[in-house]
Amino acid sequence: RPSFSLVEDTTLEPEEPPTKYQISQPEVYVAAPGESLEVRCLLKDAAVISWTKDGVHLGPNNRTVLIGEYLQIKGATPRDSGLYACTASRTVDSETWYFMVNVTDAISSGDDEDDTDGAEDFVSENSNNKRAPYWTNTEKMEKRLHAVPAANTVKFRCPAGGNPMPTMRWLKNGKEFKQEHRIGGYKVRNQHWSLIMESVVPSDKGNYTCVVENEYGSINHTYHLDVVERSPHRPILQAGLPANASTVVGGDVEFVCKVYSDAQPHIQWIKHVEKNGSKYGPDGLPYLKVLKHSGINSSNAEVLALFNVTEADAGEYICKVSNYIGQANQSAWLTVLPKQQAPGREKEITASPDYLE
């Protein structure tokens, strides 16, 4: 049952070479194991709310309580970590908001670049200056939570110094981490202060602690590893984009749609239009026109630029993205002001995210 009548046909088909699509991450809720977590579904005017975890329906059980717009998880465990979504079903439409839950002691994150030669991490001390262990490069330790696809290689680093030169050992979930604890073992590169695990599997999930010590003291740092088994998902659009805009007659304006998709997406910019003086077809559905779509002759499909706008250009602009898995769309409004009024970026946005995973 199509929800609109297209003035120009649309298909699933992406026609242009891919670019690198990326978005900001969904909101993350962190809880320590054993804690209770309560999340409110941030959607308005919901007649019925349904919840999913990792794309699968979530129902109440002895630890999961669903009351109205609230999801409560009692006595959280690492298994509760994942991508959650609440969908608000209304009489005329539905909307989805998604968020991450991480049940872990770790709370910060950063980048995870490869070692070069690692020489900067191996600090030699003047033999007279006795010193307890200390971290030499905390920037490389900021990313505590590592969510890694299965089969990837993981590297945890604890660059340290001290005099005498400290030793490093690793714990998994608070206990000595032995080679036989995982198939294929692991590598410790002492001069890089690193632990390397190749081809990670779900059983590698857990807390990894480096303990760096010498006769003058001991310091430690814990990383949390989550091994993610994923299925391909439909496009996700960055919340808040495209954003409402206003300009004067004759002005220029740009709408931006930021896309994440792990299958090549097809992007369309669509606007409500009139046909034969009517905004709606005989079936009662609105007429829509495809203004731009990703294709061979279309550069940077994530941006819709309008030049020398007229009052007729005012209205709702829809960014619709599809891949072979599914679709997502969000919209924004363009207000065209008379020449004497100064334009301004509108504060409120009416973008309504439509994504699941």
């Epitope: 699933l12 329906h57 792990d262 072979y324 898995i325």
Partner: antibody, heavy 113, light 107 residues
């Protein structure tokens, strides 16, 4: 868990139509394309088309566009594939699949006079 | 339409062998390629998506590689339960064409 359950086997005469159903459960039905794939006896796989239940958007393989019709009923989380003007070469197993990740068990359609 | 050419059409190997199946596309598909395993009388099962990503629940002995027009599915150590027909599929553009299939048997 995600499940796609298809309707049972059909035997049809040439020129008739057949309507195969695919009932989805365990996920938000409207959020994924449902694809249909044909597999003739002893042959490979052939994509027929897809439908997006949320808005009814469809896309067809040109080879099937004239005779195949895909529809979705969001109230029952069911997708239908109707094939008209049947001929003997339509004898095949027809699969529905949620974004090619989860597949139905297949429906055998036999066209014979 | 994008044509997908698989080779070999069939192969026989011993348990523990490394098995390689190749798939060629008639034009650049930018890594938009899936691999499936189909056992007799059963529906296809997704093994690899996006040319290199292992689907949920698939043993790590399966791996995918390639880019542009040339792609490979590798089974690092063939197991008896891997006897099946394997298909590649273009998921860049419609129609989402499949390769002709590779039948894998145990010697």
């Amino acid at each position: 868990q995600v499940q796609l359950v298809q309707s049972g086997a059909e035997v049809k005469k040439p020129g008739a139509s057949v309507k195969v159903s695919c009932k989805a459960s365990g996920y938000i039905f409207r959020n994924y394309y449902i694809h249909w794939v044909k597999q003739a006896p002893g042959q490979g796989l052939e994509w027929m088309g897809a439908i997006y239940p949320d808005n009814g958007d469809t896309s067809y393989n040109q080879r099937f566009k004239v005779r195949a019709t895909l529809t979705a009923d969001t109230s029952t989380s069911t997708v239908y594939m109707e094939l008209s003007s049947l001929r003997s070469e339509d004898t095949a197993v027809y699969y529905c699949a949620r974004a090619f990740t989860y597949w139905g068990q297949g429906t055998t359609v036999t066209v014979s006079s | 339409d994008i044509q997908m050419t698989q080779s070999p059409s069939s192969l026989s190997a011993s348990v523990g062998d490394r098995v390689t199946i190749t798939c060629g596309a008639s034009e650049n598909i930018y890594g938009a390629l899936n691999w499936y395993q189909q056992k007799p009388g059963k529906a296809p099962k997704l093994l690899i998506y996006g040319a290199t990503n292992l689907a949920d629940g698939v043993p790590s002995r399966f791996s995918g590689s390639g880019s542009g027009t040339d792609y490979t599915l590798t089974i690092s150590s063939l197991q008896p339960e891997d006897v099946a027909t394997y298909y590649c599929q273009n998921v860049l553009s419609t129609p989402y064409t499949f390769g002709g299939g590779t039948k894998v048997e145990i010697k």
